[in-house]
């Protein structure tokens, strides 16, 4: 039995489940999805398929399977069972497919803001509007004094009035795409708290 391979696919995109079986004399391969029969491919190239005929092809003329126009519910376990006359038992290759959406622009919200002794302190939180899965967030802090990266969805900010302005950008990534937020300027962000030296706002 082969190892379990994790495969990522993009919504509306395609994915190929690759079989590397050059050393074996294959008679036929049976493909299943969550135990449901998908296709059988014989060595003469003849295939018998269940549904999804328009979405499943065997591109190399051999046994690897390409699945197109991916939907969210295509996520799951795929299995290739390889039958050979030269082997008593069938060989098995298993895959787990996860279909991801392309990320839209992440949204940024500001937490409670305080202004003490001319220093504006707050948190910026980055998130995807529709709560997408497996998203990794990175913050870029840009300015004359800094060019730093910060991992995680929450960025703690401490900016002193009179310092050069800073720009904050949130970058969101998932296995199939990446996107970034609108830039946020420290000066604009902190303007609300500027009038009152000890103010707090949400």
């Amino acid at each position: 039995s082969g190892t379990l391979k994790k495969v990522a696919g993009a919504l509306d995109g395609s994915v190929t489940f690759t079989l590397n079986i050059t050393e074996i004399k294959v008679d036929y391969v049976v493909w299943t999805f969550n135990t449901f029969f998908l296709a059988m491919v014989k060595k003469d190239g003849v295939t018998s398929q269940s549904s999804n005929k328009e979405r499943i092809v065997f591109p190399d003329g051999l046994y690897s399977m390409k699945l197109s126009q991916l939907k969210k519910n295509d996520s799951g376990a795929y299995r290739a069972e390889i039958y050979s006359t030269s082997s008593q038992a069938s060989l098995i290759q298993e895959y787990v497919l996860h279909v991801y959406k392309h990320l839209s622009r992440p949204k940024v919200t500001m937490g409670l803001q305080s202004n003490k002794n001319g220093t504006c302190v707050t948190n910026l939180t980055c998130c995807m509007e529709h709560g997408e899965e497996d998203v990794i967030y990175t913050w870029k802090a840009l300015g004359q004094a800094a060019n730093e990266s910060h991992n995680g969805s929450i960025l703690p900010i401490s900016w002193r009035w009179g310092e050069s302005d800073m720009t904050f950008i949130c970058v969101a990534r998932n296995p199939v795409s990446r996107n970034f937020s609108s830039p946020i300027l420290a000066r604009k962000l902190c303007e609300g708290a500027a009038d009152d030296p000890d103010s707090s706002m949400v």
């Epitope: 990522a8 392309h102 840009l142 990534r173 296995p175 990446r178 830039p183």
Partner: antibody
Framework: EVKLLESGGGLVQPGGSLKLSCAAS????????MSWVRQAPGKGLEWIGE????????NYTPSLKDKFIISRDNAKNTLYLQMSKVRSEDTALYYC????????????WGAGTTVTVSS | DIVMTQSHKFMSTSVGDRVSITCKAS??????VAWYQQKPGQSPKLLIY???TRHTGVPDRFTGSGSGTDFTLTISNVQSEDLADYFC?????????FGGGTKLEIK
């Protein structure tokens, strides 16, 4: 040292095909999005497309989508550009480029490989 | 596609001078703009990203500015080694697009 080295360029007839390669070294190739960019003689830069680390997403400039195919082999640390149905306007220097920190701007470029389309 | 227009194909300057190269986007790209330098016979080299952040090792005489649709690369105290083509690039939306380039000539 981080390096990209393109190869496979040459003279090709109109309507013909060619496959370019880009060998990467000095960094973890399997973690990076990678792009192809071309530059026609005496002209500006044109982004062709990009591929994500596991090949599940490939984005192209719309006008080139039907004639170019980008692929990669992480085991070989190599990026590919399959060109088909080439025309004289595809004559250019072809660069592969790596985005800085996986962002969208390119800090590492190869020296390029020249493709000349002529009969 | 977003069109990046560099209206000056050529710019002439003298060593020690200050020169500004402009780039105009056909629609708002925020600050998602990079600048590259390409010396004769060489590959492009990243100078500026996020409109104004200098890439590692780039001399501080190179300054990027702008947001929205209008961007500028300013070279102060121009040196003879700055003779090159300069390209802007937007990465706000697909497909990424470059300006046509500005060739800086040293008098």
């Amino acid at each position: 040292e981080v390096k990209l080295l393109e190869s496979g360029g040459g003279l090709v007839q109109p309507g013909g095909s060619l496959k370019l390669s880009c060998a990467a070294s000095g960094f973890d190739f399997s973690r990076y999005w990678m792009s192809w960019v071309r530059q026609a003689p005496g002209k500006g830069l044109e982004w062709i497309g990009e591929i994500n680390p596991d090949s599940s997403t490939i984005n192209y400039t719309p006008s080139l989508k039907d004639k170019f195919i980008i692929s990669r082999d992480n085991a070989k640390n190599t990026l590919y550009l399959q060109m088909s149905k080439v025309r004289s306007e595809d004559t250019a220097l072809y660069y592969c480029a790596r985005p800085d920190g996986n962002y969208w701007y390119f800090d590492v470029w190869g020296a390029g490989t020249t493709v000349t389309v002529s009969s | 596609d977003i069109v990046m227009t560099q209206s000056h194909k050529f710019m002439s300057t003298s060593v020690g001078d200050r020169v500004s190269i402009t780039c105009k986007a056909s629609q708002d790209v925020g600050i998602a703009v990079a600048w590259y330098q390409q010396k004769p016979g060489q590959s492009p080299k990243l100078l500026i990203y996020w409109a104004s952040t200098r890439h590692t090792g780039v001399p501080d005489r190179f300054t990027g500015s702008g947001s929205g649709t209008d961007f500028t690369l300013t070279i102060s105290n121009v040196q003879s080694e700055d003779l090159a083509d300069y390209f802007c690039q937007q990465y706000s939306s697909y497909p990424y697009t470059f300006g046509g380039g500005t060739k800086l000539e040293i008098k």
